[in-house]
């Protein structure tokens, strides 16, 4: 997260980290006791999922292995379209005040809505600085028309843009798959942006979750 600050303790109980061994790979969100939602480009053969603490490496955190993941069938490594994936936990997460399910959206929020993006990704770019504490930053949803002015034909209609005019506030490497939460519901998953991260007026690009609620529910049902 660029130009952010540590999240208020316990304010993001649905936030998870996908680890490769002990190393941060991506962010994600807990959908229910068995399922984590993240970005398709975060796919690995096996994951260690960190839940229940804002601090990576916290011994009190839950750590659950996951070895099954289901990318959206329309995901493209070239265009990053349909950049979402469900990861099935090998054992159930224990819900608590620090481990909660995210609220999936019933509608798509409009441009101008203030949202929060969070993650353990690098706070500097191009040289990297990975924080141990979960970082947050507030950004506003940007209309597809305005975002297309920057990204032209690279923007697909299931991509959502967010940022603050003339500000560096944005997500970065390691935040991928993490949540963009607006008015208490999950509206986006961190997908991509320009490099180095935090260039003013280059919005962050997210997978627009409201367009995929049916796929999410159908996939979880299918692979119960």
């Amino acid at each position: 997260i660029i130009d952010g600050a540590p999240c208020a303790r316990g304010s993001h109980p649905w936030q998870v980290a996908l680890l490769s061994g002990n190393q941060l790979h991506c962010g994600g969100v807990l959908v229910n006791e068995r399922w984590v939602l993240t970005a398709a480009h975060c796919k690995m053969n096996e994951y260690t999922v960190h839940l229940g603490s804002d601090t990576l490496g916290d011994r009190r955190a839950q750590r659950i292995k996951a070895s099954k993941s289901f990318r959206h069938p329309g995901y493209s490594t070239q265009t990053h379209v349909n950049d979402l994936m469900l990861v099935k936990l090998n054992s159930q997460a224990r819900l608590s005040s620090m481990v909660k399910k995210v609220r999936l959206p019933s509608r798509c929020e409009p441009p101008g809505t203030t949202c929060t993006v969070s993650g353990w990704g690098t706070t500097t770019s191009p040289d990297v600085t990975f924080p141990s504490d979960l970082m947050c930053v507030d950004v506003k949803l940007i209309s597809p028309q305005d975002c297309t002015k920057v990204y032209k034909d690279l923007l697909e209609n299931s991509m959502l843009c967010a940022g603050i005019p003339d500000s560096k506030k944005n997500a970065c490497n390691g935040d991928s798959g993490g949540p963009l939460v607006c008015r208490g519901t999950l509206q986006g998953l961190v997908s991509w942006g320009t490099f180095p991260c935090g260039q003013p007026n280059d919005p962050g690009v997210y997978t627009q979750v409201c367009k995929f609620t049916k796929w999410i529910n159908d996939t979880m049902k299918k692979h119960r």
């Epitope: 690279l154 942006g193 490099f195 280059d202």
Partner: antibody, heavy 128, light 107 residues
Framework: QVQLVQSGAEVKKPGASVKVSCKAS????????MHWVRQAPGQGLEWMGS????????NYAQKFQGRVTMTRDTSISTAYMELSRLRSDDTAVYYC?????????????????????WGQGTTVTVSS | EIVLTQSPGTLSLSPGERATLSCRAS???????LAWYQQKPGQAPRLLIY???SRATGIPDRFSGSGSGTDFTLTISRLEPEDFAVYYC????????FGGGTKVEIK
């Protein structure tokens, strides 16, 4: 395979402008910065500037500020470099070169892999 | 602006000999962003080394890079006939700067 193909040689009069194109293939054009480098006869390499194909953001070397314009058309994976108010000392071979990443995604940090792909060069001759 | 100074300007050696090329920066350069290129007459530059010491794809292991901060070195352990060319160092931070080049010629 990954390649950059540049437009053909140009002969221009002093004061005119030249626009050189660089068409990318074999990789995601928007994923990497495109840089322009020139080389005057018998001289070394001189960096002119770069464009981020994703956002269109440009970085120009101080020496060329106000005279150079770099643009891109992502729909045809092509970058352009236009140099105006040409002088005889602009006579050179102009190269496009693929630079570092222009977008981020994924969990890992980027290593800069150097300019691993270059165009074949476009000779621009400025003569009255 | 970072200035890169290469030395010597010309290096006269025989095939089989070792070549040591120097690149000095006017201020500290992150070794992640230091590269070396080879250029032969009428050809585009070819990437040899990136990140100060990592060989690019397809580059023979007789080429090696080292250094950090302001002093970097390209070493060719045993010169082959095809290695006689001009070599440039380059930094990326994120603007590019090239050194003036070192010509390696046959003695």
């Amino acid at each position: 395979q990954v390649q950059l193909v540049q437009s053909g040689a140009e002969v221009k009069k002093p004061g005119a402008s030249v626009k050189v194109s660089c068409k990318a293939s074999g990789y995601t054009f928007a994923g990497y910065d495109m840089h322009w480098v020139r080389q005057a006869p018998g001289q070394g390499l001189e960096w002119m500037g770069s464009i981020n194909p994703t956002s269109g953001r440009t970085n120009y070397a101080q020496k060329f500020q106000g005279r150079v314009t770099m643009t891109r058309d992502t729909s045809i994976s092509t970058a352009y470099m236009e140099l105006s108010r040409l002088r005889s000392d602009d006579t050179a071979v102009y190269y496009c070169a693929r630079g570092g990443p222009s977008t981020w995604y994924g969990g890992s940090a980027y290593t800069y892999y150097g300019a691993d792909v270059w165009g074949q060069g476009t000779t621009v001759t400025v003569s009255s | 602006e970072i200035v890169l100074t290469q030395s010597p300007g010309t290096l006269s050696l025989s095939p089989g000999e070792r070549a040591t090329l120097s690149c000095r920066a006017s201020q500290s350069v992150s070794s992640d962003y230091l590269a070396w290129y080879q250029q032969k007459p009428g050809q585009a530059p070819r990437l040899l080394i990136y990140g100060a010491s990592s060989r690019a794809t397809g580059i023979p292991d007789r080429f090696s890079g080292s250094g950090s901060g302001t002093d970097f070195t390209l070493t060719i352990s045993r010169l082959e006939p095809e290695d006689f060319a001009v070599y440039y160092c380059q930094q990326y931070a994120p603007l590019w700067t090239f050194g003036g080049g070192t010509k390696v010629e046959i003695k």
